[in-house]
């Protein structure tokens, strides 16, 4: 079967780590140094990715798989396969065109990446603010104000059933 298939398309027999070499009458040749082919039947080997500058090597290139990069400390990956490195900020900040800026009042960011997000509006859920928000932390919502009024039972009634498709904040 292998020989029959190779008569139809000799390149289909070339395994990963090789390419179908037109300069050699389409015999399979191993990938040259610093190149790879991760699947069989390739007509060329791809040049290995080089992790330079702000990128650092997470996995070395081999003849059958590309190198994988991540970012040096103080940066984080963005994009498929870590195609970009973006500067980290502190918690409570977001990255702008002018660098890291503190979150505006009413917003927070609990990570070193991403944007500042608005604090949860507890009143939309009929609840009160139990712990105030900060630049680094969201507010913590507590029981509804009615539950805290004098004479109210200390036993919390069951939460009303929500409409399907709505999840709690």
């Amino acid at each position: 079967f292998e020989r029959t298939r190779s008569l139809q398309d000799p390149c289909s027999n070339c395994p990963a780590g090789t390419f179908c070499d037109n300069n050699r009458n389409q015999i399979c040749s191993p990938c040259p140094p610093n190149s790879f082919s991760s699947a069989g039947g390739q007509r060329t080997c791809d040049i290995c990715r080089q992790c330079k500058g702000v990128f650092r090597t997470r996995k070395e290139c081999s003849s059958t798989s590309n190198a994988e990069c991540d970012c040096t400390p103080g940066f984080h990956c963005l994009g498929a396969g870590c195609s970009m490195c973006e500067q980290d900020c502190k918690q409570g900040q977001e990255l702008t065109k002018k660098g890291c800026k503190d979150c505006c009042f009413g917003t927070f960011n609990d990570q070193k990446r991403g944007i500042c997000r608005p604090w949860t509006n507890c009143s939309l859920d009929g609840k009160s603010v139990l712990v105030n928000g900060t630049k680094e932390r969201d507010v913590v919502c507590g029981p509804s104000p009615a539950d805290l009024s004098p004479g109210a039972s200390s036993v919390t009634p069951p939460a009303p059933a929500r409409e399907p498709g709505h999840s709690p904040q």
Epitope: G17, P30, C31, P32, P33, N34, E60, C61, S62, S63, T64
Partner: nanobody, 111 residues
Framework: AVQLVESGGGLVQPGGSLRLSCAAS????????ISWYRQGPGKQRELVAW???????HYVDSAKGRFTISRDNTKKTTYLQMNSLKLEDTDVYYC?????WGQGTQVTVSS
């Protein structure tokens, strides 16, 4: 340039073993990839096993589990240990690196 000379071929019964050798001379510092190929009369040369530039050994499916490629840099020699030989392994076996080919060594498996 690199010169390659194969040896170790011969006649062997099915199920038997052979060890082919490929001795390199010349500018051997340029050798990063070394391969064994086979070729039957009137047929295309076929890759059998190779040591890639990352020093990892690779095999085509028909050689996996039976053949072992290894390299002894001190002796400037690459080996192909062939075990559990089958009738269909009969061919001329060639050593290759880049544009350099050896003259081939005949392997015949016959009962």
């Amino acid at each position: 340039a690199v010169q390659l000379v194969e040896s170790g071929g011969g006649l062997v019964q099915p199920g038997g073993s052979l060890r082919l050798s490929c001795a390199a001379s010349g500018n051997i510092s340029s050798i990063r990839v070394i391969s064994w190929y086979r070729q039957g009369p009137g047929k295309q040369r076929e890759l059998v096993a190779w040591i890639a530039w990352d020093n990892i050994a690779h095999y085509v499916d028909s050689a996996k589990g039976r053949f072992t490629i290894s390299r002894d840099n001190t002796k400037k020699t690459t080996y192909l240990q062939m075990n559990s030989l089958k009738l269909e392994d009969t061919d001329v076996y060639y050593c290759n690196s880049g544009d350099s080919w050896g003259q081939g060594t005949q392997v015949t498996v016959s009962s």
